[in-house]
Amino acid sequence: AITEAREEAKPYPLFPGPFPGSLQTDHTPLLSLPHASGYQPALMFSPTQPGRPHTGNVAIPQVTSVESKPLPPLAFKHTVGHIILSEHKGVKFNCSISVPNIYQDTTISWWKDGKELLGAHHAITQFYPDDEVTAIIASFSITSVQRSDNGSYICKMKINNEEIVSDPIYIEVQGLPHFTKQPESMNVTRNTAFNLTCQAVGPPEPVNIFWVQNSSRVNEQPEKSPSVLTVPGLTEMAVFSCEAHNDKGLTVSKGVQINIKAIPSPPTEVSIRNSTAHSILISWVPGFDGYSPFRNCSIQVKEADPLSNGSVMIFNTSALPHLYQIKQLQALANYSIGVSCMNEIGWSAVSPWILASTTEGAPSVAPLNVTVFLNESSDNVDIRWMKPPTKQQDGELVGYRISHVWQSAGISKELLEEVGQNGSRARISVQVHNATCTVRIAAVTRGGVGPFSDPVKIFIPAHGWVDYAPSSTPAPGNADPVLII
């Protein structure tokens, strides 16, 4: 069986810079320190046993040669433990081991931070056979190092199902500071303090931060990253950035604009999408929001009639979808309409006023004081009424529609008459004797037919009756009147 031995390592700080066994490659050629030098590698922690110094596994083979001499323990030779280099530079490092020739098919694999490196990496393994042993040198090269190449690299070799692991080679890629948090654009309330954050990392550390506002440095001396700037308030737009400095140089963050919230600009392009007798659908294009979201809008409606009392109707609505149906308007009327919108700061001015008109509508009330009486001499029913109030005609009267229903012995017949707008009386022929005639009248405009009046009933007797009184629209509260003669 193969046993495992572990060398103890002398701890050296891994950071910030060179130490025995580390290598700054910017100016120094790569060194391979021989095992005999007495060099002890840096303190590295085994991924499987955190906290324990680890310098690789040593396989002690139990196989003996013909002369029964035990073979020397197999271990990777010590090499450089720490390489420090700048971003975009090239680096090459290697592992070497001497393996007795009795072992066949030995392969070396490279691992970084516990994961095997496969595929498109520049790893080359060279074999130098001798009489009894073969020297194997595994080289790993990176042509242009990036921060992501930082880490701990090891070689592994499998022999007889046992693993031999090299000491780690720690690669530290240094470069300009790299931002992990940059200031963000904001919209702020005037004269109100707010915070901006900037964070950058190396290596090398430390990273120091300067804040810049409108091209002027805010802090005379740098602050260690991360840094929070409390801006005491602004009265006008400002541009902020932060500078991150380390020993390699300076990186400047993106510049961010901090805007001051203000009342919105007035809406523009208020337009009429649709008009009916009692409503107008309007739309508008919102003005600039003042760097603060719109909350709601107010539609102001004034009668354009110079004789009107000038009162303003106000309708509140949500800011979206920039559409509103104004209801409860009079038909055939002219209105001035303006729109104003608000954000958290306040209301915009009112948009330019536009003129809009409602269309004709069907009358909203029925003719009044409908009276009905029988004229036996001419065998007619005379009907009289009063036209609805002008305000409620909702347009120009073009006439009236008269509905008369004749009911007798289970038979019912409805007839409709149209009457010109000038009259306020009509005469209809008696259709059926010994029957009830029910009359209703509606006013008519181009906008349509209005509501019918309450029904007025009159009884039409058989021939020979003499005395007839008129029937009329009942007083409110009396439903369905019938005149019995």
């Epitope: 004269n191 802090n219 005491p232």
Partner: antibody, heavy 118, light 106 residues
Framework: QIQLVQSGPELKKPGETVKISCKAS????????MNWVKQAPGKDLQWMGW????????TYADDFTGRFAFSLETSASTAYLQINNLKNEDTATYFC???????????WGQGTLVTVSA | QIVLSQSPAILSASPGEKVTMTCRSS?????MHWYQQKPGSSPKPWIY???NLASGVPGRFSGSGSGTSYSLTISRVEAEDAATYYC?????????FGGGTKLEIK
């Protein structure tokens, strides 16, 4: 609490040198710049410049280049103002002031009166 | 360099009066600081970054302004307010102070 304590008054002759000190306490000295402000008798405040307490690099206002020197003794949290080849017009009270964001001088020394007279 | 002009140079007021002093800059600046100085004393920080009262400053003081025009207002002057008030700009190097406004109480 934060304090800036300046050295006492000085009476000097023209051509001599004076070095006044400003000892800071109550905060990390090397985190904030130290500014120097001149006030001649009955006159306005004049910003002379500042010294970076971390790097030791001084910055002088245009009217204070040449004969004026800012320096530090970081281990003692002390900043110094030295004026060489003193002139009568150097007679003034000199204040040190702790720098902050937006060049806000939230803490001032009590002032050192330097009198230059033959 | 930016020149700060304070007016008036001397301001005389009775207790309870409202007073305003102004500081105009030769170019636009981001913030104006104000300091109060009484004879024989070092300046005291008074108003930070245009409108923020320093610790211990009474609420009757206020600051405002932007661009090239800034002001310090005392809503009801008290005897203890007698002092010289200096403005100092932030926004351009070198740092500069105004010539001061001396407030006298009648």
């Amino acid at each position: 609490q934060i304090q800036l304590v300046q050295s006492g008054p000085e009476l000097k002759k023209p051509g001599e040198t004076v070095k006044i000190s400003c000892k800071a306490s109550g905060y990390t000295f090397t985190n904030y710049g130290m500014n120097w402000v001149k006030q001649a008798p009955g006159k306005d405040l004049q910003w002379m410049g500042w010294i970076n307490t971390y790097t030791g690099e001084p910055t002088y206002a245009d009217d204070f280049t040449g004969r004026f020197a800012f320096s530090l003794e970081t281990s003692a949290s002390t900043a110094y103002l030295q004026i060489n080849n003193l002139k009568n017009e150097d007679t003034a009270t000199y204040f040190c002031a702790k720098g902050g964001h937006y060049a806000w001088f939230a803490y001032w020394g009590q002032g050192t009166l330097v009198t230059v007279s033959a | 360099q930016i020149v700060l002009s304070q007016s008036p140079a001397i301001l005389s007021a009775s207790p309870g009066e409202k007073v305003t002093m102004t500081c105009r800059s030769s170019s636009s600046v981001s913030y104006m600081h104000w300091y109060q100085q009484k004879p024989g004393s070092s300046p005291k920080p008074w108003i930070y970054a245009t409108s923020n009262l320093a610790s211990g400053v009474p609420g009757r003081f206020s600051g405002s302004g932007s661009g090239t025009s800034y002001s310090l207002t005392i809503s009801r002057v008290e005897a203890e307010d007698a002092a010289t008030y200096y403005c100092q700009q932030w926004g351009s190097n070198p740092r500069t102070f105004g010539g001061g406004t001396k407030l006298e109480i009648k």
